[in-house]
Interface confidence: low
């Protein structure tokens, strides 16, 4: 054996974001032949041997970070990258806008404008179909998710959440969905690359928008990811996925 | 049963600051969030702001900001909301009320009557 | 902030007639709506929540209805206990505004 046992995958089924007393498995999944699983839930004292947790209702104590490992032999494997199983319709949900309207022209720029009744302050805008958000520290009590020069494959449905950073796997409901109509073009998201461009973040602290843009313009199932924003005066690029900006009280 | 228990009336004068409780009991105090609103007779409910004392977040209404503090302590389970530079225009009843998953406020306290007057 | 305009300020109503309030958002709050009665001397109750789910022990001569900007509060068949100021609520967007009330009066 050269170098430590290759990291499992694990996944929540059907998704990580679970509405609470909503079932949800989390499967641990390494290579044939595994001797043992241990799945654990990361900042508490609780694992098991198993491949799979099944848990029938959601509740708030299980929303958390999880991971897996496996063992073969006397050898442990590399952990998997950590699960963050989140509860959802803990809160009410936020409502979801789009400035200046939800139908806007192939070019053209729009804002989703996530808002919450709640002093919470972060969001996650999620695009129906993509499998991951963009999260967004809060202005006041909303968000803007800026898109700028859209296309054909930012058409779609729009769903945003609110929570808090000091309990971040506890979310809203979601938003009513928001449909965004893009005209004026005949390119469709079929046509799309299938190799994701990097993704910039911007972080603008006198206005508190999350400026996501793209080296070709596009806004894709697979540039669909979460987004760390950093303050602008920080010298440090956006950090990895998961990781929250917090705006200072 | 849900209860919250807020003092009757409070005299204060102009310029001072009063600081308003509100005990909660029957429920778990830190699930829920606890608003405060004002009433003056014949011009309605005004929502203050609230707060969630598990996590101390809080939000205000901006016409509010400048003059009530919202805090908790959750060892005796009381919200308190402190008013500060008192006017005649902030004479009136102030309530505390909670809410919990949804934002409708269910349990309301019986509200404390504030009179600013030298 | 969003302004909820509640209409008749006062009803004069007879024991046993059917009350209609309605409230006007100055835009759209999907349903998120609540009303609720205040008795003199005492702290507003919520009766509705949702602009249509009636809280628990609420007796279900009170309905709500409504969507968008136009919310609509009834009693089917008022009784005397029912005299109290009604408000409506919205807490789609913050600050939370209210209406301004509607007394309702027995005769």
């Known amino acids: 054996q050269s170098g430590p046992l290759p990291k499992p995958s694990l996944q929540a089924l059907p998704s990580s974001l679970v509405p609470l007393e909503k079932p949800v498995t989390l499967r641990c999944q390494g290579p044939p032949g595994v001797d043992l699983y241990r799945l654990e839930k990361l900042s508490s004292s609780r694992y098991q041997d198993q491949a799979v947790l099944f848990i029938p209702a959601m509740k708030r104590s299980l929303a958390g970070r999880y991971r897996c490992s496996y063992q073969n032999g006397s050898l442990w494997s590399l952990p998997s990258d950590q699960l963050e199983l989140v509860a959802t319709g803990v809160f009410a949900k936020p409502s979801l806008s789009a400035q200046p309207g939800p139908a806007v022209s192939s070019g053209g720029d729009v804002t989703l404008q996530c808002q919450t009744r709640y002093g919470f302050d972060q969001f996650a805008l999620y695009k129906e179909g993509d499998p991951a958000p963009y999260k967004n520290p809060e202005r006041w009590y909303r968000a803007s998710f800026p898109i700028i020069t859209v296309t054909a494959a930012h058409s779609g449905t729009y769903r945003c959440y609110s929570f808090s950073s000091r309990d971040p796997y506890l979310w809203s409901a979601p938003s009513d969905p928001l449909e965004l109509v893009v005209t004026g073009t005949s390119v469709t998201p079929s046509r799309l690359p299938t190799e994701p461009p990097s993704p910039v973040a911007e972080f603008s602290e006198a206005t508190a928008e999350l400026t996501v843009s793209f080296t070709n313009e596009v806004f894709t199932t697979e540039t669909s990811r979460s987004i760390t924003a950093s303050p602008k005066e920080s010298d440090s690029p956006a950090g990895p996925a998961r990781q929250y900006y917090t705006k200072g009280n | 049963q849900v209860q919250l228990q807020q003092p009757g009336a409070e005299l204060v004068k102009p310029g001072a600051s009063v600081k308003l409780s509100c005990k909660a009991s029957?429920?778990?105090?830190?699930?829920?969030?606890m608003h405060w609103l004002k009433q003056r007779p014949g011009q309605g409910l005004e929502w203050i702001g609230m707060?969630?004392?598990?996590?101390?977040?809080?939000n205000y209404n901006e016409k509010f900001k400048n003059k009530a503090t919202l805090t908790v302590d959750k060892s005796s389970s009381t919200a308190y909301m402190q008013l500060s530079s008192l006017t005649s225009e902030d004479s009136a009843v102030y309530y505390c009320?909670?809410?919990?998953?949804?934002?409708?406020?269910?349990?309301w306290g019986q509200g404390t009557s504030v009179t600013v007057s030298s | 902030s969003i302004v909820m305009t509640q209409t008749p300020k006062f009803l004069l109503v007879s024991a046993g007639d059917r009350v209609t309030i309605t409230c006007k958002a100055s835009?759209?709050?999907?349903?998120?709506v609540a009303w609720y009665q205040q008795k003199p001397g005492q702290s507003p109750k919520l009766l509705i929540y949702?602009?249509?789910n009636r809280y628990t022990g609420v007796p279900d001569r009170f309905t709500g209805s409504g969507y968008g900007t136009d919310f609509t509060f009834t009693i089917s068949t008022v009784q005397a206990e029912d005299l109290a100021v009604y408000f409506c609520q919205q807490d789609y967007s913050s600050p939370p505004t209210f209406g301004g009330g509607t007394k309702l009066e027995i005769k």
């Open positions: 707060i969630h004392p598990n996590s101390d977040i809080t």
């Open positions: 009320a909670r809410s919990g998953d949804y934002y409708a406020m269910d349990y």
């Open positions: 029957g429920y778990t105090f830190t699930s829920y969030w």
């Open positions: 835009q759209s709050v999907s349903n998120d």
């Open positions: 949702y602009a249509s």
